[in-house]
């Protein structure tokens, strides 16, 4: 049966995808065939074939970026070290270990789901703009995060969430494969408004909040808080 595992990694970091037999295992590298591929597209990530040091079948996206340790393989550790993780690496990887002496029976089959994350930049909230006499517009921008964020606007007076119908979010996938988000909030003009824009990264369990206050139509952008006071289901920023 195929074992299933999950692992998380930050964009740009290195990660180990675990695929190992119990401790104390010993393998002959002239007998074992090891194959890492992506589960959906079956892209070849890396492999080991006895008496064959060339990896000509490895996909160009993984060449020189995905390695197994020969010393580890001798001990039954066929884990994959993946360098410089990119958002495109967020997928399922399948490790298959076959024994030639056992008639190419599968010795080990492990599927590892890699979740990729990147911190969003601290949001920037524009000074309020008045498209009409009875309306105020705020714009919140945050860039280079992963995965796709959630955006919330908060009434800072009581930490309540504003109605999401009042906001219009546009999420872009940028050239690096990371997300940029722009959220526009339209609210009725009031003498004094104290609001905040919250960018939530669910995978990182992280919220980035910037406040903007209007008093006589003067905007503030100096209330930057990571992990704001609890707003409903929002969590403190932790990385696990």
């Amino acid at each position: 049966d195929t074992q299933e595992k999950e692992v998380r990694a930050m964009v740009g970091s290195d990660v180990e995808l675990s695929c190992a037999c119990p401790e104390g295992s010993r393998f002959d590298l002239n007998d074992v065939y090891v194959y890492w591929q992506t589960s959906e597209s079956k892209t070849v990530v890396t492999y080991h074939i006895p008496q064959n040091s060339s990896l000509e079948n490895v996909d160009s996206r993984y060449r020189n970026r995905a390695l197994m340790s020969p010393a580890g393989m001798l001990r039954g550790d066929f884990s994959l070290r993946l360098f410089n993780v990119t958002p495109q690496d967020e997928q399922k990887f399948h490790c298959l270990v076959l024994s030639q002496s056992l008639g190419f029976q599968e010795v080990l089959s492990v599927e590892v789901t890699l979740h990729v994350a990147a911190n969003f930049s601290v949001p920037v909230v524009s000074a309020p703009h008045s498209p009409s006499q009875d309306e105020l517009t705020f714009t919140c921008t945050s860039i280079n995060g992963y995965p796709r964020p959630n955006v919330y606007w908060i009434n800072k007076t009581d930490n309540s969430l504003l109605d999401q119908a009042l906001q219009n979010d546009t999420v872009f996938l940028n050239m690096r494969g990371l997300y940029d988000v722009v959220s526009v909030l339209r609210i009725a003009r009031t003498p004094s408004v104290n609001i905040g824009c919250c960018i939530e990264n669910v995978l990182l369990q992280q919220n980035l909040t910037v406040g903007s206050q209007t008093g006589n139509d003067i905007g503030e952008r100096d209330k930057i808080t990571e992990n704001p006071v609890s707003t409903g289901e929002k969590n403190a920023a932790t990385w696990s």
Epitope: S41, K42, I49, L96, G103, Q105
Partner: antibody, heavy 118, light 107 residues
């Protein structure tokens, strides 16, 4: 234990259709390329078609446009849809598994006879 | 397409004999060659892959050699159960192709 069990052979008239099936067990079916090889009565082995683990398909010129290979990984099954059958397609058809990365046929089905006759 | 030519097409030998079957590819296939044994009314069985690697469970009297275009299958001491038809096959590129077979019969 790796096993490939075939079904679906039989008698068909020229121009007719038939669908062969091959059920795999004892291995992670979705991670292997699978092939069909045939053998006409008293003749040698002839490669027919292949489907890669990722779904890419390959055909011998003699069957291109008439045969379609497919797989259902959820059912651990391989199929060969044969249309516009001709007398020269009459053969025992074998499904075969290909060793990961290596490329040769390490396990074969038991074979199923396709008879094309009017 | 790569043509595979086997010789001889048939061969009579006795138990205990040493037998060699050759296979020639019409173009270089590195070591991407396999040998199969087939008995009447049975599916082929893999013997050798990568030109010289013995498949699991295959007796050591079977051996393969060669690379590029010329390959051989050798049975060092024929046993009664070895009388069958033998095929070579290239898996260097599609379409995969087989030799025409060598039928090994009892003398």
């Amino acid at each position: 234990e790796v096993q490939l069990v075939q079904s679906g052979g039989g008698l068909v008239h020229p121009g007719g259709s038939l669908r062969l099936s091959c059920a795999g067990s004892g291995f992670t079916f979705s991670s292997y390329a699978m092939h069909w090889v045939r053998q006409a009565p008293g003749k040698g082995l002839e490669w027919v078609s292949a489907i890669g683990a990722g779904g890419g398909t390959y055909y011998a010129d003699s069957v291109k446009g008439r045969f379609t290979i497919s797989r259902d990984n959820a059912k651990n099954s391989l199929y060969l849809q044969m249309n516009s059958l001709r007398a020269e397609d009459m053969a025992v058809y074998y499904c075969a598994r290909v060793v990961v990365v290596v490329g040769f046929f390490d396990y074969w089905g038991q074979g199923t006879l396709v008879t094309v006759s009017s | 397409d790569i043509q595979m030519t086997q010789s001889p097409s048939s061969l009579s030998a006795s138990v205990g004999d040493r037998v060699t079957i050759t296979c020639r590819a019409s173009q270089g296939i590195s070591s991407w060659l396999a040998w199969y044994q087939q008995k009447p009314e049975k599916a082929p069985k893999s013997l050798i892959f990568a030109a010289s690697s013995l498949q699991s469970g295959v007796p050591s009297r079977f051996s393969g050699s060669g690379s590029g275009t010329d390959f051989t299958l050798t049975i060092s001491s024929l046993q009664p159960e070895d009388f069958a038809t033998y095929y070579c096959q290239q898996y260097n590129s599609y379409p995969y192709t087989f030799g025409q077979g060598t039928k090994l019969e009892i003398k």
